[in-house]
């Protein structure tokens, strides 16, 4: 940013440098040769988050429960309200203007990362030796049952969707 005729936290108006209003305040009147910049605090439902010369404060974001939103952090005169999603939902976009249900991982897939208020469930295919037979937003792939440790033998091979079926060993006659 090239140097300008006014310092940081100042702005140029009518051939003079006026002080910007601090965060949380809006501009009422510019300075003159004889008076300082006049600023006023934002009202309770408004904010300004930078040094500014705005004549209007911004409205706090409304976390609309009809869109699945709730307040994560209440706004102040210097910060906007932060919304997050209700349990079981996550933000549709970075701006989090509405929420959608977490997706479930289908049979054959397990949960790699559980969803949060801002990110969806991440699924992964169950590798060989693991399976998932449910549609779930929480369950990871589970390992196939080890028939050997139970002194049993595999009667039916497992898949990514089914566990192995164990059975008794054939007795030798």
């Amino acid at each position: 940013e090239p140097p300008t005729a006014c310092r940081e936290k100042q702005y140029l108006i009518n051939s003079q440098c006026c002080s910007l209003c601090q965060p949380g305040q809006k501009l009422v009147s510019d300075c003159t040769e004889f008076t300082e910049t006049e600023c006023l605090p934002c009202s309770e439902s408004e904010f300004l988050d930078t040094w500014n010369r705005e004549t209007r404060c911004h409205q706090h974001k409304y976390c609309d429960p009809n869109l699945g939103l709730r307040v994560q952090q209440k706004g102040t005169s210097e910060t906007d309200t932060i919304c997050t999603c209700e349990e079981g939902l996550h933000c549709m976009s970075e701006s989090c203007e509405s929420c959608v249900p977490h997706r479930s991982c289908l049979p054959g897939f397990g949960v790699k990362q559980i969803a949060t208020g801002v990110s969806d469930t991440i699924c992964e295919p169950c590798p060989v030796g693991f399976f998932s037979n449910v549609s779930s937003a929480f369950e990871k792939c589970r390992p196939w049952t080890s028939c050997e440790t139970k002194d049993l033998v595999v009667q039916q091979a497992g898949t990514n969707k089914t566990d192995v079926v164990c059975g008794p060993q054939d007795r030798q006659r």
Epitope: R7, Q16, E33
Partner: antibody
Framework: QVQVQQSGAELVRPGTSVKVSCKAS????????IEWVKQRPGQGLEWIGV????????NYNEKFKGKATLTADKSSSTAYMQLSSLTSEDSAVYFC?????????WGQGTLVTVSA | HIQMTQTTSSLSASLGDRVTISCRAS??????LNWYQQKPDGTVKLLIS???RLHSGVPSRFSGSGSGADYSLTISNLEQEDIATYFC?????????FGGGTKLEIK
């Protein structure tokens, strides 16, 4: 009382440079911006740029970027405008003025004539 | 850039007349409007800043008014020494811009 005194008329060759001075008195030099304005014969006023003598910060009219360079010397309460690569289009009267809620006090103007 | 328009480029009036010179900006300039007087010898003086604030030493027959994009300068009782060209200038947004000027002459 506030006074703004500019350097005298200049006759210069095309392609050369010229430096116009603007000496301020009767007030605290670093407390006010210095503005520069161009006036071609029989024409209106055109803003060139502004300098803050306190620390040398400037703003220029895009049209004069690369043409005009503004500087200031606090010790002598003098602002300067250098005009480079002069052409006949640069022939004009150049004014400096003290800022502070409009161009509050003007110099008498410096006539720059570019001619071979 | 904000364009400043002085529709009347020259104006003829008699001594003692009330004269009004107008100036229009291409957008709202929030009353950051200044008026200057340039005498025939080239000297320039600030008359009015911030639409209506009389600069020190300027006779009270000069006054300014306006808001938004429309402004005017009034000389209530024209005198011989008021023969000059009058320029408006906006100080709201860089680059500062001037009107084309209104040349005031005596009838």
């Amino acid at each position: 009382q506030v006074q703004v005194q500019q350097s005298g008329a200049e006759l210069v060759r095309p392609g050369t440079s010229v430096k116009v001075s603007c000496k301020a008195s009767g007030y605290a030099f670093t407390n006010y911006l210095i503005e520069w304005v161009k006036q071609r014969p029989g024409q209106g006023l055109e803003w060139i740029g502004v300098i803050n003598p306190e620390f040398g910060g400037t703003n220029y009219n895009e049209k004069f970027k690369g043409k005009a360079t503004l500087t200031a010397d606090k010790s002598s309460s003098t602002a300067y405008m250098q005009l480079s690569s002069l052409t006949s289009e640069d022939s004009a009267v150049y004014f400096c003025a003290r800022g502070g809620g409009g161009f509050t006090y003007w110099g008498q103007g410096t006539l720059v004539t570019v001619s071979a | 850039h904000i364009q400043m328009t002085q529709t009347t480029s020259s104006l003829s009036a008699s001594l003692g007349d009330r004269v009004t010179i107008s100036c229009r900006a291409s957008q709202d300039i929030s009353s950051h409007l200044n008026w200057y007087q340039q005498k025939p010898d080239g000297t320039v003086k600030l008359l009015i800043s911030y639409t209506s604030r009389l600069h020190s030493g300027v006779p009270s027959r000069f006054s300014g008014s306006g808001s938004g994009a429309d402004y005017s300068l009034t000389i209530s009782n024209l005198e011989q020494e008021d023969i000059a060209t009058y320029f408006c200038q906006q100080g709201n947004t860089l680059p500062w811009t001037f009107g084309g000027g209104t040349k005031l002459e005596i009838k």
